[in-house]
Interface confidence: medium
């Protein structure tokens, strides 16, 4: 049983890694917008037991214009970027806690990397822009990612985490 494509959210895109049951994904606000405090970008593929049909839960996400970007003049084509914003913290893991930062050379570091999933794609809804494009800005100090992304990219990976030592098929890790 799999979910259909998730619903669209105004001024946001979603990077779907898996359409399978219980998959958790997140929407990301487009460039120039940020997640409104108190709203959640998370959605989950769940089963309606009455109908035996899978569907995505409705996110409460509201993407609002980022006032920090309103008065910015456009950058020249060779350096198309968007100013970074720091959103309100939002939990991406079921426990509500993010994995602790670790040394890149540690085993845990490599294992967490393996959350990268083969076949995950960024689907452009328009042709990619030239110059350097901001896809999403920095995470807050709480350790959660910003909800901004370049307008022409639809993200398709989840915020799931792999335990140390678990490597998805299709990737190798060399340390």
């Amino acid at each position: 049983i799999t979910c259909p494509p998730p619903m669209s959210v105004e001024h946001a895109d979603i990077w779907v890694k898996s359409y399978s049951l219980y998959s958790r994904e997140r929407y990301i606000c487009n460039s120039g917008f940020k997640r409104k405090a108190g709203t959640s970008s998370l959605t989950e593929c769940v089963l309606n037991k009455a109908t035996n049909v899978a569907h995505w839960t409705t996110p409460s996400l509201k993407c609002i214009r980022d006032p920090a970007l309103v008065h910015q003049r456009p950058a020249p084509p060779s350096t198309v970027t968007t100013a970074g914003v720091t959103p309100q913290p939002e939990s991406l893991s079921p426990s509500g806690k993010e994995p602790a930062a670790s040394s890149p050379s540690s085993n845990n570091t490599a294992a967490t990397t393996a959350a990268i999933v083969p076949g995950s794609q960024l689907m452009p809804s328009k042709s990619p822009s030239t110059g350097t494009t901001e896809i999403s800005s920095h995470e807050s100090s709480h350790g959660t990612p910003s909800q901004t992304t370049a307008k022409n990219w639809e993200l398709t990976a989840s915020a799931s985490h792999q335990p140390p030592g678990v490597y998805p098929q299709g990737h190798s890790d060399t340390t």
Partner: nanobody
């Protein structure tokens, strides 16, 4: 401001080799993991490879494993992708992309990409 400029693309016959370079500026390059992603004609953007901020850890998508090698030179703020045994299916625009998170591996979020360099593999 962050700038990523790729170079080294071109046309090559199947079995050939190319080395892509990415010149980074505007951020503390040595603190960030870096990625190569690619977009084949008419397809979505596909993640190819990632390297840790200190260069000690690398990871590849299955289709390029054993053929591509990602590396970096933090002193030069440069990222590289050595591509050997190229196949027609490697034809794509290749982008270098900066990872979102400082000094940690987590999913494959990245926040900036360059303008890309075209790689064409054809006989």
């Amino acid at each position: 401001e962050v700038q990523l400029v790729e170079s080294g693309g071109g046309s090559v016959q199947p079995g050939g080799s190319l080395t892509l370079s990415c010149a980074a500026s505007g951020f503390a390059f040595s603190l960030y993991h870096m990625n190569w992603v690619r977009q084949a004609p008419g397809k979505g953007l596909e993640w190819v490879s990632r390297i840790s901020n200190d260069g000690t850890s690398t990871i590849y998508t299955d289709s390029v494993k054993g053929r591509f090698t990602i590396s970096r030179n933090n002193a030069k703020n440069a990222l590289y992708l050595q591509m050997n045994s190229l196949k027609p299916e490697d034809t794509a625009v290749y982008y270098c992309a900066k990872s979102t998170y400082d000094s940690r591996w987590r999913d494959h979020d990245y926040d900036y990409r360059g303008q890309g360099t075209q790689v064409t593999v054809s006989s």
